[in-house]
Amino acid sequence: LRPSRVYKPEGNTKRALTLKDILNGTFSYKTYFPNWISEQEYLHQSEDDNIVFYNIETRESYIILSNSTMKSVNATDYGLSPDRQFVYLESDYSKLWRYSYTATYYIYDLQNGEFVRGYELPRPIQYLCWSPVGSKLAYVYQNNIYLKQRPGDPPFQITYTGRENRIFNGIPDWVYEEEMLATKYALWWSPDGKFLAYVEFNDSDIPIIAYSYYGDGQYPRTINIPYPKAGAKNPVVRVFIVDTTYPHHVGPMEVPVPEMIASSDYYFSWLTWVSSERVCLQWLKRVQNVSVLSICDFREDWHAWECPKNQEHVEESRTGWAGGFFVSTPAFSQDATSYYKIFSDKDGYKHIHYIKDTVENAIQITSGKWEAIYIFRVTQDSLFYSSNEFEGYPGRRNIYRISIGNSPPSKKCVTCHLRKERCQYYTASFSYKAKYYALVCYGPGLPISTLHDGRTDQEIQVLEENKELENSLRNIQLPKVEIKKLKDGGLTFWYKMILPPQFDRSKKYPLLIQVYGGPCSQSVKSVFAVNWITYLASKEGIVIALVDGRGTAFQGDKFLHAVYRKLGVYEVEDQLTAVRKFIEMGFIDEERIAIWGWSYGGYVSSLALASGTGLFKCGIAVAPVSSWEYYASIYSERFMGLPTKDDNLEHYKNSTVMARAEYFRNVDYLLIHGTADDNVHFQNSAQIAKALVNAQVDFQAMWYSDQNHGISSGRSQNHLYTHMTHFLKQCFSLSD
């Protein structure tokens, strides 16, 4: 038996983090995003739940909706109508999947100071939104779309085809919500509120995933979700546009699908209104290396939407899949014809391009061995975007302004030198025409949100600086965080290392690798976090490392597309390479190395443990994928192709965790899964367990009854992290 080892941070009055600190969320931070209602006005929900109005220029602020009004209907969210006459209040929030939820909605009349009575909204509603002009309401109830011209008016039913688990109007089905749209809605108002575009998803032929929900009853319920796994039948999508001024005269008009897309299985990927009578739709072939952007115009004479072939723009990848995680969306200029879009340049780096007529004639706006990440706003004279260009760190985000009025366009980094040590990872929120904007910095220091003048970039005020958090962290021994790169052969891997307080290079420490590693993900980011791994470093003296291997994002397509059609190979190989390099650094105890991950990270950690290298003593997989055949079609096929003999079945089969069951014999493996996981089905872990049992390999397992992919209920989360901590401490011979 090895002697147990206790890590004691030396001579310091500061205390180490405790697991309780993490589980209680003691050190969580706040951000401040203005809810813009004009160029210089915004709303914000205060700590005590009042809805407060702010005018930046006049410095006025006052409560427009009191917390007592909010409380009267137990409201947790709100939405002001663009004409400012009404507010919807949202209550009875009931989560469904990642983005979707149902809720009860009440409409409050600001002038009368009372709730609108008569023709009250049905409940529960799946989605509700105001028109961009006036106070029309569109909502989805029982998979059908309804329209109200005014809050007190009777509703007009736009669709009638909606049916639970079969046809979805204006809201996505499971797979589109999770893997394509990343929203709870699939309807979009035209800028003037005249037209309403929506998607109809037909899931009638999709196989059903069924799992038990145990609840408290004598018999469990069965949850049924149409869920297309790799190679299965997919949803059938159609896009319609309805004139909301006269919805009863002319029914919804279908928008045609481009010929080159419609010839085989395809996806709808996004919709962008360009002007009041021009709309842009994006489509994707089922084999996701061809994307088509189609610009369509309303033809009053035909009462139809026309999408001419010369307004189709094709984006194709020859080395992998189109886009990053999703295909990027266009940011249109004021001429309603030309647009800016991020896609790969000839060197394989994702950059902003300006498209006036054809993609072939696109003008590249940014370039370099870094990537443009997101276009925030295009105004008459400026384009605001984020990138990881500054100082060559892929895990940073800065906001840039390109003056497009100038010739040649000039570029300025808005954020690079603001709070250089504290802030290296930003996002932004712009008023309509970028007269003002808020910057939200996520770290590496304490997050801070600030308000800025859109013309001069001058800081106007601090919106949130997390002073309370700063004070409560004063007496905490936080670990030291380093972000560096290591080289192996011709490859460069960025890593983040979290080192215990009073770290001493001459001593040996246990090492825990935290991995995600999914295609187009990024783990090594310059952001602030106090979480479980922070505690493990602070209190338990464990060195933590996160490594971005091949397949991860924002370092060019050569690095990103390396994993195309062969998931489970290089992601694992690169974690192993990094561990060997860490051992060479001299402060890692080779006998005490572990790996853990969740979801895709659970897949990678499982494969790493079963790599037969002997590098790892133990590891944990939470809600792992175990075979790409078990996961969603849109995701699996994007990176792996189809699980058919003439496509990529062979690699689907030999990239499973089950195929490596024998190799788990010499490691301690903890396998964890929620039984009500709608995303990575419990089936994945059930099959790993079955394979391990069949191979007579001992392992540890924990299931969480009725928990989904996040295992996020308070009690379950506490149990999960306590259980994982015990497992790790036992593995590393650390006493309790």
């Epitope: 006005e41 006049t58 600001l110």
Partner: nanobody, 116 residues
Framework: QVQLQESGGGLVQVGGSLRLSCVAS????????MSWVRQAPGKGLEWVAS????????YYADSVRGRFTISRDNAKNTLYLQMNSLKSEDTAVYYC?????????VNQGTQVTVSS
């Protein structure tokens, strides 16, 4: 102090037109979202139209959309309401308001009477 002075009201035939003005003083007019509201005899305040501080977004009540046009001249600190195709139900006292949202606080106003 803040002052809003409405003018331009009067008696007009059904189908006729009027242009109301509202001169602002005592505050930075160009930074304010402005609105026109009205009060018909024996009724409560009714919102009519609003305009953004920079003048490039406007909103109208359904009852006046297509007939009324709100505009502003920030150089002159003046808000306007052009009223066309007037109906008898447009009879009311019209007020301009600098409140960014309801409830609106109003001063004197200008009387508009539409007779048949």
């Amino acid at each position: 102090q803040v002052q809003l002075q409405e003018s331009g009201g009067g008696l007009v035939q059904v189908g006729g037109s009027l242009r109301l003005s509202c001169v602002a003083s005592g505050f930075t007019f160009s930074s304010y979202y402005m609105s026109w509201v009205r009060q018909a005899p024996g009724k409560g305040l009714e919102w009519v139209a609003s305009i953004y501080a920079d003048g490039d977004m406007t909103y109208y009540a359904d009852s006046v959309r297509g007939r009324f046009t709100i505009s502003r001249d920030n150089a002159k600190n003046t808000l306007y309401l052009q009223m066309n195709s007037l109906k008898s139900e447009d009879t009311a006292v019209y007020y301009c308001a600098k409140d960014p949202l309801p409830p609106y606080h109003v001063n004197q106003g200008t009387q508009v009477t539409v007779s048949s």
